[in-house]
């Protein structure tokens, strides 16, 4: 709860310009859901549904709420202390190496493989070789022989939120 974020912790695009940096109020930082005023004297609320801050901080601005893309569903809305939680729609997933977009799950496994894991919002279907049991990371199933699957039921949120 009492972790704190200062200007230095932010990504460059979220950081205030150097001349805007102010010291915290002598009594401490501003609570989650707030940012510090320009003169460093007051704490100002983030705007509900528009921006947020998650920790005690000396930010001059709250962080802008994420808007879920088309192809995503909103699991929980943005509050003053928590970013929006977005999740890929059923039948699509978000890969760690391309978190910016939801990709369609494969409909089946290549020849000689069996499905051991369903499509979830954070992973494609999982296929293993029938004999060896080793996982397959290939993209395109062989057309001649596929094991079809229906999209899995989402089990837990996959969030890009801060």
């Amino acid at each position: 709860e009492s972790a704190l974020i200062t200007q230095q912790d932010l990504a460059p695009q979220q950081r205030a310009a150097p001349q805007q940096k102010r010291s915290s109020p002598s009594e401490g930082l501003c609570p989650p859901g707030h940012h510090i005023s320009e003169d460093g004297r007051d704490c100002i609320s983030c705007k509900y549904g528009q921006d947020y801050s998650t920790h005690w901080n000396d930010l001059l601005f709250c962080l802008r709420c994420t808007r879920c893309d088309s192809g995503e569903v909103e699991l929980s809305p943005c509050t003053t202390t928590r970013n929006t939680v977005c999740q890929c729609e059923e039948g699509t997933f978000r890969e760690e190496d391309s978190p910016e977009m939801c990709r369609k799950c494969r409909t089946g496994c290549p020849r000689g493989m069996v499905k051991v894991g369903d499509c979830t919002p954070w992973s494609d279907i999982e296929c293993v070789h029938k004999e060896s049991g080793t996982k397959h990371s290939g993209e395109v199933p062989a057309v001649e022989e596929t094991v079809t699957s229906s999209p899995g039921t989402p089990a837990s949120p996959c969030s890009l939120s801060g």
């Epitope: 009492s2 989650p32 007051d42 704490c43 100002i44 609320s45 202390t81």
Partner: antibody
Framework: KVQLQQSGAELVKTGTSVKLSCKAS????????IHWVKQRSGQGLEWIGW????????KYNEKFKDKATLTADKSSSTVYMELSRLTSEDSAVYFC??????????????WGQGTLVTVSA | DIVMTQSHKFMSTSVGDRVSITCKAS??????VAWYQQKPGQSPKVLIY???TRHTGVPDRFTGSGSGTDYILTISSVQAEDLALYYC?????????FGGGTKLEIK
Amino acid sequence: KVQLQQSGAELVKTGTSVKLSCKASGYTFTEYIIHWVKQRSGQGLEWIGWFYPGSGSIKYNEKFKDKATLTADKSSSTVYMELSRLTSEDSAVYFCARHEEGGYSAWFPYWGQGTLVTVSA
Amino acid sequence: DIVMTQSHKFMSTSVGDRVSITCKASQDVSTAVAWYQQKPGQSPKVLIYWASTRHTGVPDRFTGSGSGTDYILTISSVQAEDLALYYCQQHYSTPYTFGGGTKLEIK
């Protein structure tokens, strides 16, 4: 059940100090800010300041900076407010209050019962 | 500091009437407004926060509305137990400030 139990009424002399207490129960003491609010007889409400037991962060209303001192004792889950150099203007009911569950917005669903401070000559 | 002005110190009403209590902020407070009810000898009780969100257990005859600088607490059908003092409060910026209060009285 969240409860804020405040100390009893005080009759004090002008120029002296008084220390009021607010004992919290029913929640994790270090996770929530405690605010103090003043109400003079037949008048409105004034925000004095906050104390955050999690880090010791304090914020005062400038108007009360030289009047109130906020402290806490984590072991007894109690926040204190000391009022110094008392005058008749300090005669009032003082409330402690706690903010909402889901965030840190300063609207107050939980209030102590209030402590009446009477300053006499 | 942000000044919260409740223009009516007193409002007379009858049981069953609809009544609106107004509050004006000296600057935009982005819907960060709460409303409290206070009865004699009691602590304030929150009714509404974020301008329009009703607190748990508050009867639905109490409704909050407004944005920018102008906010309203409406009681759709006043009950005898609603006779009390009502305060608005901005929770937008420190120092948090309250309106002067509006006392709801029976005609």
